[in-house]
């Protein structure tokens, strides 16, 4: 019993002695956040100069504050212990960790392309001011029917088949029926439209191919090799739609 007590006391003394030795050997470890260990002044803790900070103790230098300029605006001012935080000016939104980039906003029903904001193609939607146009939900995958048609601004709403429930009432997450819904006239006309569009695309690419053979391959290569740029322009192009099919993927009141 006495032996274990002796061991504990000895360990504590060793730890305390180590801490004391460490602070004697490295006086910088005593410098708190908001200061730096100044080698030019006999390792005295000096406060960080203006427009700089140190978020942890024992630092030998202070970091330069981030400056929110141009399309960035200051969300939180820099202090001696923490960096400034930026967000984006109206009409832009943050991208990346700590809002490292600002990307142009688009209207609902649009997506940002290298040519600016473009309307979502038929069959796709975007209900936000950022991101890409996504295909409407395919209700039949869940054995459900379309309750409300989609638009470029909003997704379709799925619901149970009309036979499943009385008019007006519907379950938000109804059980999926086992049977596949029959081919309605809408589906047939949709597939006809899809086939004719595919044929038109085929004709277009054939024509393009022959014109490229004549004029050389340089121009076509340039079109496909051009990097995707995030334009920082404020004009919104609304002519035509962006036909790129992506992968699936406050108020004060009193009552």
């Amino acid at each position: 019993m006495g032996n274990s007590c002796y061991n504990i006391v000895a360990t504590l003394l060793l730890v305390l002695n180590f801490e004391r030795t460490r602070s004697l050997q490295d006086p910088c470890s005593n410098c708190p956040a908001g200061t730096f260990c100044d080698n030019n002044r006999n390792q005295i803790c000096s406060p960080c100069p203006p427009n700089s900070f140190s978020s942890a103790g024992g630092q030998r230098t202070c970091d330069i504050c981030r400056q929110c300029k141009g399309v960035f605006r200051t969300r939180k001012e820099c202090s001696s212990t923490s960096n400034a935080e930026c967000d984006c000016t109206p009409g832009f939104h943050c991208l990346g960790a700590g809002c490292s980039m600002c990307e142009q906003d688009c209207k609902q029903g649009q997506e940002l392309t290298k040519k600016g904001c473009k309307d979502c193609c038929f069959g796709t939607f975007n209900d936000q001011k950022r991101g890409i146009c996504r295909p409407w939900t395919n209700c039949s995958l869940d054995g459900k029917s379309v309750l409300v048609n989609g638009t470029k601004e909003r997704d379709v709403v799925c619901g149970p088949s009309p036979a499943d429930l009385s008019p007006g009432a519907s379950s938000v997450t109804p059980p999926a029926p086992a049977r596949e819904p029959g081919h309605s006239p809408q589906i047939i006309s949709f597939f006809l439209a899809l086939t004719s569009t595919a044929l038109l695309f085929l004709l277009f690419f054939l024509t393009l191919r022959f014109s490229v053979v004549k004029r050389g391959r340089k121009k076509l290569l340039y079109i496909f090799k051009q990097p995707f740029m995030r334009p920082v322009q404020t004009t919104q192009e609304e002519d035509g739609c962006s036909c790129r099919f992506p992968e699936e993927e406050e108020g004060g009141c009193e009552l």
């Epitope: 939900t137 995958l141 409300v148 638009t151 601004e153 709403v157 799925c158 938000v172 699936e248 993927e249």
Partner: antibody, heavy 127, light 110 residues
């Protein structure tokens, strides 16, 4: 049956922090958008934040941006709300809410509303 | 001030019909689906209407929703004493990148 149970509320001083949890059961947690909604005593509902299951995207009300962080652990069927730099105006009952429309089949849940709610946990901010 | 405007109170006698309005703008109600919630005293809200006008299973057909332009309405017919509650409209607001609730309407059954 959908069950949502909030915890972690309590008394905290202005400038303090609190972490709320919401334990979910009775549905496939990893397939639904989840929100936090708050209600100050005698006041109206105020949406706080939402997190999507597929891409992990998060959105916040302007009043809490930069102070609150929503997160989820799909393996534990739990939703979290980390609240820092708390102010007197953050005092409210905080509800955890499940959105309708299962993902990834459903692309957007905004049409389906919040079809499941917890009973709420009270957060008091006072010195 | 809430983004969506609702009348603070509404009232009606049993058996009658009452309508609660909710007005917004093109960035919220105009281009997005409206949902309605009922909050009985001392309880959590309950979804009443989704996608502008559809009822989840279990909600009586006395409740109906409609939308026109940047305004939405909730109608309750055959009013009952148990309908006495706070009613909220809500939708997604793309310009705020978030959901918005109305200020709520306190319904009193006289």
């Amino acid at each position: 049956e959908v069950q949502l149970l909030e915890s972690g509320g309590g008394l905290v001083q202005p400038g303090g922090s609190l972490r709320l949890s919401c334990a979910a059961s009775g549905f496939t947690f990893s397939g639904y958008d989840m929100s936090w909604v708050r209600q100050a005593p005698g006041k109206c509902l105020e949406w706080v934040s939402v997190i999507y299951p597929d891409d992990g995207n998060t959105y916040y009300a302007d009043s809490v941006k930069g102070r609150f962080t929503i997160s989820r652990d799909n393996s534990k069927n739990t939703l979290y709300l980390q609240m820092n730099s708390l102010r007197a105006e953050d005092a409210a009952v905080y509800y955890c809410a499940k959105h309708g429309g299962q993902k990834p089949t459903t692309k957007s849940s905004s049409a389906y509303g919040m079809d499941g709610w917890g009973q709420g946990t009270l957060v008091t901010v006072s010195s | 001030q809430s983004v969506l405007t609702q009348p603070p109170s509404a009232s009606g006698t049993p058996g009658r019909r009452v309508t609660i309005s909710c007005s917004g703008s093109s960035s919220n109600i105009g281009n997005n689906y409206v949902t309605w919630y009922q909050q009985l005293p001392g309880t959590a809200p309950k979804l009443l209407i989704y996608a502008d006008s559809h009822r989840p299973s279990g909600v009586p057909d006395r409740f109906s929703g409609s939308k026109s332009g940047t305004s939405a309405s909730l109608a309750i017919s055959g009013l009952r004493s148990e309908d006495e509650a706070d009613y909220y409209c809500a939708t997604w607001d793309y310009s705020l990148s978030g959901y918005v609730f109305g200020g709520g309407t306190k319904l009193t059954v006289l």
